[in-house]
Interface confidence: medium
Amino acid sequence: DFGLDCDEHSTESRCCRYPLTVDFEAFGWDWIIAPKRYKANYCSGECEFVFLQKYPHTHLVHQANPRGSAGPCCTPTKMSPINMLYFNGKEQIIYGKIPAMVVDRCGCS
Amino acid sequence: DFGLDCDEHSTESRCCRYPLTVDFEAFGWDWIIAPKRYKANYCSGECEFVFLQKYPHTHLVHQANPRGSAGPCCTPTKMSPINMLYFNGKEQIIYGKIPAMVVDRCGCS
């Protein structure tokens, strides 16, 4: 399994992982105590046939070509959690691992 | 976690799981001994803001709105394996569980 890494200067048009810092303060999400910002990353780019396909299923659907199947799209294929300190709905402070907050790899599925 | 299930008669335009039978014989994939066909399913439909979003990350990227982020797309969010009997590249018969061959649920990511 591998994926492309790009930045804002890249000329790569294919599915790629780009850096993105999420700033909770800028969003006005003041119930998040920490971190105030973190590196989330995101996926963008084109999914040509077979390029970076995570699952054999993606290839099979392309072969079968059913009505309305839009072809694969560039989406996270590996994600990781971050630890966060935040207020829950009952105003209790919670420290926990929040899954799938960081994109580690992008692919076509 | 939940996802919509549709069929070819559905009028649903949002992200949905549709039935699809993959026929290896029709593809000419004769290195696959069994099964000759199986129910794979596929995802199709629109991803309106927040509808069926699997990860908080998806929402955060939408909020941050970086250059080139295309918005979430309808993609498998839960997949399951099938057992297969097939020839590998060395012409040995292999019996194994192949991951991510069946779409169990679709969502926006």
């Epitope: - | 290896f24 014989e25 000419g28 004769d30 290195w31 696959i32 001994i33 069994a34 099964p35 000759k36 099938i82 057992n83 297969m84 009997l85 020839f87 012409e91 018969i93 019996y95």
Partner: antibody, heavy 124, light 107 residues
Framework: QVQLVQSGAEVKKPGASVKVSCKAS????????MHWVRQAPGQGLEWIGN????????NYNQRFKARATLTTDTSTSTAYMELRSLRSDDTAVYYC?????????????????WGQGTLVTVSS | DIQMTQSPSSLSASVGDRVTITCKAS??????LSWFQQKPGKAPKTLIY???RLVDGVPSKFSGSGSGQDYTLTISSLQPEDFATYYC?????????FGQGTKLEIK
Amino acid sequence: QVQLVQSGAEVKKPGASVKVSCKASGYSFTGYFMHWVRQAPGQGLEWIGNIYPYNGVSNYNQRFKARATLTTDTSTSTAYMELRSLRSDDTAVYYCARRYYYGTGPADWYYDVWGQGTLVTVSS
Amino acid sequence: DIQMTQSPSSLSASVGDRVTITCKASQDINSYLSWFQQKPGKAPKTLIYRANRLVDGVPSKFSGSGSGQDYTLTISSLQPEDFATYYCLQSDEFPLTFGQGTKLEIK
């Protein structure tokens, strides 16, 4: 429909060879194992071996391994069974049969279609 | 090789009778057993596979049972077209081996 059509009856002398053909139609020939079974007059069934036309991988009954060769011609969807150094006790009807998988385990199959049989008579 | 012992080797019965044929393997064959019907001058026809599953199109008067080493084919109500020779086959292990057959005749 799925069909297996075998070549006609043969009369051979002891020590000679015979090559029986089995032409498949109505399905993807390369995707199914073909088995060969024989039946001596008034006797039971005996398994000779099988072959996967996709790549020619074969298995033999040890009793026949030295004398039998299973081959296929994918361009004509035909399977062949050649038996060498014939003896009088090789006189039998030879059948081809398609192995059909209903599951995904290595033994999850049965014979769903048989050829009509080819009588091979070995006599001096 | 796995030996398949089929019994009886011949059986006389009347139309309407219920008959049972048995097959014993020399070792556990994990229910990988098929039953065949063969009429004179014809190729065998698979009736039952995996010990108890009926092939599509085969009448439900045929049934199979058993596990381990012991297996049974039952014909619930004999009809004239059922008089034939029946064979069992184990497909658990190479070489595949057949029972010696049971000839079912009209009494």
